[in-house]
Amino acid sequence: VPEKSVRWCAVSEHEATKCQSFRDHMKSVLPSNGPSVACVKKASHLDCIRAIAANEADAVTLDAGLVYDAYLAPNNLKPVVAEFYGSKEDPQTFYYAVAVVKKDSDFQMNQLRGRKSCHTGLGRSAGWNIPIGLLYCDLPEPRKPLEKAVANFFSGSCVPCADGTDFPQLCQLCPGCGCSTLNQYFSYSGAFKCLKDGAGDVAFVKHSTIFENLANKADRDQYELLCLDNTRKSVDEYKDCHLARVPSHTVVARSVGGKEDLIWELLNQAQEHFGKDKSKEFQLFSSPHGKDLLFKDSAHGFLKVPPRMDAKMYLGYEYITAIRNLREGTCPEAPTDECKPVKWCALSHHERLKCDEWSVNSAGKIECESAETTEDCIAKIMNGEADAMSLDGGFVYIAGMCGLVPVLAENYNTPNPNCENTAEEGYFAVAVVKSSSDLTWDNLKGKKSCHTAVGRTAGWNIPMGLLYSKINHCRFDEFFSEGCAPGSEKNSSLCKLCMGPSPNLCEPNNKEGYYGYTGAFRCLVEKGDVAFVKHQTVPQNTGGKNPDAWAKNLKEEDYELLCLDGSRKSVQEPANCHLARAPNHAVVARKDKADCVQTLLLDQQRMFGSSVTDCSSNFCLFESKTKDLLFRDDTVCLAKLHDRNTYEKYLGEEYVKAVTNLRKCSTSPLLEACTF
C-alpha cells in the first residue's frame, strides 16, 4: 500500500461507486505526491471497523453508536475527523439528547416512573437508546425484554416502530406505533407534538427539536429540560442540562499508526474542492446513487478532532454509560442512591503511595487510580475511570471547561472549628528572588526562571499572564534564558533547568525534582534567578522546616519578593508585594459524583484532617513532608463552597478572564479537546 494512500471502507454497491468517483476526482485535483484514495468494500459497518483494526482499510464514517463499537477492544479505533452541520462560522459537530417537559409539571428526572413518555422511535439515539440506557438501572426487573420493562416503568408511551401486539403500553399514546410520518407522533417533531398535545408528560428528543417546532420564544418558555442532577433548566440551557452529548457522524481510524494526519489532509482538500457548492462534477455531501453515501448529505464540512480526544472523551461519559447499560445489561448491586467508594486520582507513584495508605485507613471508602499528569487525571475523572482530585486553580479552570465541578476548597488560614464553612479569599502568587541578587520585576528578561508547572496558577498563569500583557507574544521561552516549567516541550529552554531524573525530566509530576511549589523553590536555591510560587513557600521551606538536605540550612531572610512596582519586600510582606491573589486549590469531580465526594471527604477529614496531631504514627490527609501530595500540606481543612459551585463562580471573574486571555498561549491538549 503506498504510504500516502487512504483506504476508504464502503458498505454497499452504491457507496463503492461513490468511493471510486471520490478516488478519481481527488486524483485529478491533487499533486502526485499528495494523498490518494483507495476503496475497500465490506458488507457492513462492523466489518469495516474490523478491517481498519486489522490494517486492511484506514477510514470509515460512523454514527455515534458505531463509534462506540469501534472504540471497544479489540478494535481500539479513535475519532479523527468530524462532520459538521450548520455554518462554517458556527459549526455543529454534536447534538444534545434532552428530556423536555411542560413547565407547569412538577417532577424531576428521578421521578419519571409512572409518567407518560414520548419517543422518536425504537432503537433511535435521542429518543430511545440514551434515555432508556440512562434509566436502565431504575427499570423494573426482569429488564429483558427491554420493551416490557419500559412498558412497566412508564404508565403509557408512544414508541414508534415498537411491536404494538407484544407491548401495547408502548403504543398507548399512538395506536399501532406507526413507523413513518403517517404516525403524527413519529420522529423528533412527532415526539415533541406528543408532549405538546398533552398525550405525554415527557418527550425524549434532541435540543434543536424545540427550536425547530416553536419559533416563538414565549411558546418555548412553556417548556423546560430535565437535568440528570434532578433539577430543571430552560430549553436554551441544553449545554448544561442534557442526557448526553452525541457526536453526529465521525471518521474513525486506528489509534496507533492510524494515518490521522493523512486522512485529515485528504478530507480537508476534498472539502475545498468538492464540498458544499464547490463543484458540479462531484459532490462530497450528496450523490445521485442514494442518500448519505460515505458522508451525511446534510454535512457542511469537516473538522479535525483534537489529538488528545480519544473515543471515550469524544462520546462522553453519559453516552457511554447509556450505551454500556443497554448493551451489557449490568447494574450495580447497591441501590443507586448509595455512595460507592470514591476513586481518587493520584499523580505518579509518590501520590499513589499516599493514596494507598489513605485507602487502607478509610477501610476501602477511598480507592486509587493513577495517571502521569494532571491533565490525564482530569481526563480519567471525565470518563469515569476516577472520581475526584484536588487541583490548583489553573487546572480547576481546565477541569471546569471539561465539564467537572468544584466540590470543596482547600483552606489554609482559617482555624477549626469554623474552617469547614468559611470561604477564604485565596493565597498570594509571588515572585521570589535571592536577597543577594539585584533583580526587579522590570529586569527579568534573560534570567533563569523556576515555575511550579505549566498551567498552574502561581507558577504560570499569573506571572505569564502579566508578562504576556507586557510583551504581547507567547514566546516565554525566549524571554527567559532558561528555566524549569514542568509540562513544557522537552526541547524547550524552559526544560533546560529541570533536574529530572532523566526519563522524568520536566514531567509535570513529583518525579521531576523541581515540580510544584517546593520544587520551584528548590530550583531557585540551586540554579535559578526567580521562582514563581505561593506566598507561603519560603517560610515553609526555611528555618529547618524542610528537613531535606538541600533545604535544611536555608534562611528566610536570604530571599525577597518582587513587587509589580519595581520594588522588593521581605517574604513576610506578601499582602503588600504580590503578583495577584490566587484562588485556593479545590477538589473537583463529575457532577453526578459531587455530592458523594463531598459527603465522604468531610467525613474523612474529621478522622484524618488537621485535628490529628501525631502524623508520625497516624495517617494524616494533609501531610507529606512539604511535598503537597494529594493536597497542599498547609491545608487546614476542606471547606464547603455554598453557592460557588461552578468553576466560574469559584475562580472569580478576574482570574477566569486572565486565564482565558492566556489561552492564546495555551499548550493544553486537554483544553483544546474539551473546547472542540
Epitope: H350, E351, L353, K354, E357, V360, N361, A363, N510, S616, S617, N618, F619, S624, K625, K627, L629
Partner: nanobody, 117 residues
Framework: EVQLVECGGGLVQPGGSLRLSCAAS????????MAWYRQAPGQQRELVAG???????NYADSVKGRFTISRDNAKNTLYLQMNSLKPEDTAVYYC???????????WGQGTQVTVSS
C-alpha cells in the same frame, strides 16, 4: 528506621496456599499502616492488602476473599495468608510501612511468588 524483610514465597500450584511474612528490625506497635504490594514483570507495583494499627483492613478487588492480612505487634511481623492462588498472582511481593514517607523509593528485596502447574 525500621528495616523490613519479606520471606515465605515460592512455587505453588493453582488453587494452593502460601503464607508470607515480613519481619521488622524494630517495634511496629507505633506504626499506623502496614501493607503488602506486588509487582509482576512489566507491571506497576500495586497494593494487595493493608492493615492499620487498629486492625482495619483493605484488599485489592482481585484478592478479596482469598488473601488475609494480619500483624503481630508482639513479634514485629506482618503476614499475608494467600489461599486459592491463581497464575495471575505470580509476582514479587513486598511489604512496606509508609514510615519513610511517600517520597523515598525504598523497597526491600521482596519475595517471589510463582503460581504455575
Amino acid at each position: 528506621e525500621v528495616q523490613l524483610v519479606e520471606c515465605g514465597g515460592g512455587l505453588v500450584q493453582p488453587g494452593g496456599s502460601l503464607r508470607l511474612s515480613c519481619a521488622a528490625s524494630g517495634s511496629i506497635a507505633s506504626i499506623n499502616t502496614m501493607a503488602w504490594y506486588r509487582q509482576a514483570p512489566g507491571q506497576q507495583r500495586e497494593l494487595v492488602a493493608g492493615i492499620t494499627r487498629g486492625g482495619s483492613t483493605n484488599y485489592a478487588d482481585s484478592v478479596k476473599g482469598r488473601f488475609t492480612i494480619s500483624r503481630d505487634n508482639a513479634k514485629n511481623t506482618l503476614y499475608l495468608q494467600m489461599n486459592s492462588l491463581k497464575p495471575e498472582d505470580t509476582a514479587v511481593y513486598y511489604c512496606t510501612d509508609y514510615s519513610r514517607g511517600y517520597y523515598q523509593d525504598y523497597w526491600g528485596q521482596g519475595t517471589q511468588v510463582t503460581v504455575s502447574s
